[in-house]
Interface confidence: low
């Protein structure tokens, strides 16, 4: 790569080299209607084309190459410029996003009559002029230069081309070189950002078509989506920015997420995680409902920006703190009620001779006479399903809308025995949406998960009440507080089966059997942990398996559902 001396600009400002970006997309941005690959990135694209005498008989191939490539950059925010050079550099078509102007520019390009020397640096000068002047609303758009030349540059001409390419780079451009025929790859690697930015065409001009896809793949920088696209007003969130080419900045520490709020203020945020196809960024806290933040990405610490059509909006979200307080009060009331209910059991112990046991009840009958549902029973003799102390590192893959794929992958405790019953409670099959997210059968409200849990709790309380009421002292029963008298008897007292540890022979460890649900109990909401329903495959690639140090962890919760 270039030395510091080579990169130094102007009158010796070596330190001013801004280590600007190298952006290489890992994959094609998308597909066009005709099925070919396309790029949806919003940046400025400059073609710097050699029209010296040596390409006289190959101009058609050069033109066709540019025309084919130009039609693959389809973002409405992408601007293009055609620059030709021989003994001087000429801007044939100034930077424009107007497709009609681009069509006319291509027509002008077709008419070019090559001739003259190879002053490539003049072409770079014309690009740098535009990069500097064509600022969009006060910020510089990311620029990509694709320079095409044939033959070797004379020593001085090479030096000047390199200097001017460095000037373009210092203005935020990424430089690619296409070398045809008798080019010097070492020279081009120094003019371009790196050797990886050189596209050698050794089989002559007719082979130019063969590199169109690889140029497209490497030069396409695009932002495709943000998740979530709606965030709660006044709350802090993390946004996943999906796209291509983020990982290949010359220095990933220089990647920034930029939020242009209501077309005025721009806030730049450092991403927590930079992957080739997505960024995990802290979203700015937007105080008001209805605010809009246009998403941009800089690969060079804010020197220039890749624009997109992705907008993040704010909405009103219900406050969870009220709900938390309400639940706390409810819990306290419940604790008091339980204390009031169970206190007489603690303090009034009935001492009676136990009657001989009745005939053994059928194990298949519950005390309400209904058949017992069979649930898996886990031998939880070893706690800490995630290793000693339950703190074995657990990696969470974040799926769309904050869901995780790990619920179905939790490790069970070592030596835990899972007994699956023959008959399971049947859950209604969730329907798949077109985006592979599951939707509950009934319309979901924000309180649906809580309601389901409260219903289940209510049923348990009713059953508990029925069971404990049998044990309550009747009027006239006497006894002393916490003064137990053991009754010697061969058979244990046969109370209703509410003991979780009731087994015919002592197990090596307690066996926990979840209480059976009442027949009218609704199925657990999707957030319920049992039974595990495999989550749909995430549309995002997984973040790095072990997050690097000093990087914030992924969001600890999915974003709240906007209030209906």
């Amino acid at each position: 790569m270039a030395t510091a001396e080579r990169r130094a600009l102007g009158i010796g400002f070596q330190w001013l080299s801004l280590a600007t970006l190298v952006l290489i997309c890992a994959g094609q941005g998308g597909r066009r209607e005709d099925g070919g690959p396309a790029c949806y990135g919003g940046f400025d694209l400059y073609f710097i084309l050699d029209k010296s005498g040596s390409v006289l008989h190959h101009w058609n191939e050069i033109y066709y190459f540019v025309e084919q490539l130009a039609h693959k950059f389809i973002s409405p925010q992408l601007r293009m410029s055609f620059i030709v050079f021989s003994t001087r550099g000429t801007t044939l078509m100034k930077l424009t996003e107007d497709r009609e102007q681009i069509r006319q520019g291509l027509e002008e390009l077709q008419k070019v009559l090559p001739g003259g020397d190879t002053y490539m640096h003049e072409g770079f000068e014309r690009a740098s002029e535009q990069i500097y002047y064509e600022n969009r609303q006060g910020y510089r758009t990311a620029s990509v230069i694709i320079a095409l030349t044939d033959g070797e540059l004379h020593e001085d001409l090479f030096f000047y081309s390199e200097r001017e390419a460095n000037r373009s780079r210092d203005l935020g451009a990424i430089v690619y070189c296409v070398g045809v025929k008798d080019f010097n790859e070492t020279q081009l690697a120094r003019i371009a950002d790196s050797k990886d930015h050189v596209f050698p065409v050794n089989d002559g001009f007719q082979a130019l078509q063969g590199i169109i896809h690889s140029i497209l793949k490497k030069s396409c920088i695009e932002i495709l989506a943000a998740e979530p696209s709606t965030i709660c007003a006044g709350e802090s969130f993390q946004v996943v920015v999906r796209g291509n080419g983020f990982r290949h900045a010359r220095n990933v520490d220089r990647v920034l997420c930029s939020f242009k709020i209501n077309d005025s203020v721009t806030l730049n945020e450092k991403p927590f995680s930079v992957e080739d196809t997505y960024l995990l960024c802290p979203a700015p806290i937007l105080k008001e409902v209805g605010m809009k933040a246009a998403l941009q990405v800089s690969m060079n610490d804010g020197l220039s920006f890749i624009s997109s059509s992705v907008i993040i909006t704010t909405t009103h979200c219900s406050d969870g703190s009220i709900l938390a307080i309400a639940l706390l009060i409810l819990f306290l009331l419940l604790a008091l009620a339980l204390l009031w209910w169970f206190w007489p059991l603690c303090c009034t112990v009935i001492i009676k001779e136990v009657p001989p046991p009745p005939a053994e009840e059928s194990e298949e009958e519950d005390d309400d006479g209904l058949p017992k549902k069979k649930w898996p029973t886990v031998d939880a003799s070893y706690y800490g399903g995630r290793g000693v102390g339950g703190i074995k590192r657990m990696e969470v893959r974040w799926g769309e809308k904050g869901s995780t794929e790990e619920g179905a992958k939790l490790e069970k405790a070592k030596n835990a025995r899972v007994k699956m019953p023959e008959q399971e409670y049947e859950f209604p099959e969730p329907r798949n949406l077109n985006n592979n997210m599951r939707r509950p059968s009934s319309p979901r409200k924000w309180y649906s998960p809580i309601k389901g849990k409260l219903d289940a709790l209510w049923v348990l309380l009713r059953k508990g009440y029925d069971r404990v009421s049998v044990m309550r002292p009747q009027p006239g029963d006497t006894g002393r507080c916490i003064n137990f008298t053991r009754v010697k008897n061969n058979q244990p007292a046969k109370y209703p089966l509410n003991n979780a540890y009731h087994t015919s022979s002592p197990p090596p460890a307690p066996i926990y059997t979840p209480p059976p649900p009442a027949p009218h109990c609704p199925p657990p909401p999707p957030s319920a942990p049992t039974p595990p329903i495999p989550s749909p495959p995430s549309t995002l690639p997984p973040p790095p398996q072990a997050p690097p140090p000093n990087r914030a962890p992924p969001p600890s919760r999915p974003p709240p559902r906007p209030s209906v």
């Epitope: 102007g10 010796g12 070596q14 001013l16 740098s128 030096f159 200097r163």
Partner: antibody
Framework: QVQLVQSGAEVKKPGASVKVSCKVS????????ISWVRQAPGQGLEWMGG????????NYAQKFQGRVTITADESTSTAYMELSSLRSEDTAVYYC??????????WGQGTLVTVSS | SSELTQDPVVSVALGETVSITCQGD??????ASWYQQKPGQAPLLVMY???RRPSGIPDRFSGSTSGNTLSLTITGAQAEDEADYYC??????????FGGGTKVTVL
């Protein structure tokens, strides 16, 4: 057409300061450095320092460090050179020139600064 | 900083060839340039790099390098070539250094 137009001649007393301007046209002002070169009567050329407007930070010759300040105003495409603590030996013609890093390809017409008590 | 040394005065007969030399340690030819200055005028770039002429400069001017010495050659000197010629380069800290100048007289 590239042009660099400098401000008019100045007469200053020793210890004073002088500020010479250089307004450019015909090219992207910020993309090129502007250097300042002076020439005392009957003497050779002497480089004082320069600035790349887009970055705003100047680079000075050792001899003038601390006495010279070079600035650029992008809005008016004008570069400035201010020399303080003037001495009689600072009497010279001061030139601004477009610096492409390997040559000064365009020069201003020069500004004569006379330091005399 | 580095110094560039030039011969103070060189004479040439009209139509003859003259070479002006510029010597300096660590001289890097790709930063080298030559300027012509006529009395009362601003300097004018006549050569840069090893042998690059800006547009408008006649082809009788040429440049060359040999070790630590730069040369500017005028082949077939004309009366209008009478002037002071300064060589210039950058030192290791990228500061610009000028030679002392050579006065070319066309006889």
């Amino acid at each position: 057409q590239v042009q660099l137009v400098q401000s008019g001649a100045e007469v200053k007393k020793p210890g004073a300061s002088v500020k010479v301007s250089c307004k450019v046209s015909g090219y992207t002002f910020s993309s090129y450095a502007i250097s300042w070169v002076r020439q005392a009567p009957g003497q050779g050329l002497e480089w004082m320092g320069g600035i790349i407007p887009i970055f705003g930070t100047a680079n000075y010759a050792q001899k003038f460090q601390g006495r010279v300040t070079i600035t650029a105003d992008e809005s008016t495409s004008t570069a400035y050179m201010e020399l303080s603590s003037l001495r009689s030996e600072d009497t010279a013609v001061y030139y601004c020139a477009r610096d492409t890093d390997y040559m000064f390809d365009y020069w201003g017409q020069g500004t004569l600064v006379t330091v005399s008590s | 900083s580095s110094e560039l040394t030039q011969d103070p005065v060189v004479s040439v007969a009209l139509g003859e060839t003259v070479s002006i030399t510029c010597q300096g340690d660590n001289l890097r030819d790709f930063y080298a340039s030559w300027y012509q200055q006529k009395p009362g005028q601003a300097p004018l770039l006549v050569m840069y790099g090893k042998n690059r002429r800006p547009s408008g400069i006649p082809d009788r001017f040429s440049g060359s390098t040999s070790g630590n010495t730069l040369s500017l050659t005028i082949t077939g000197a004309q009366a209008e070539d009478e002037a002071d010629y300064y060589c210039s380069s950058r030192d290791n800290s990228k500061h610009v250094v000028f030679g002392g100048g050579t006065k070319v007289t066309v006889l």
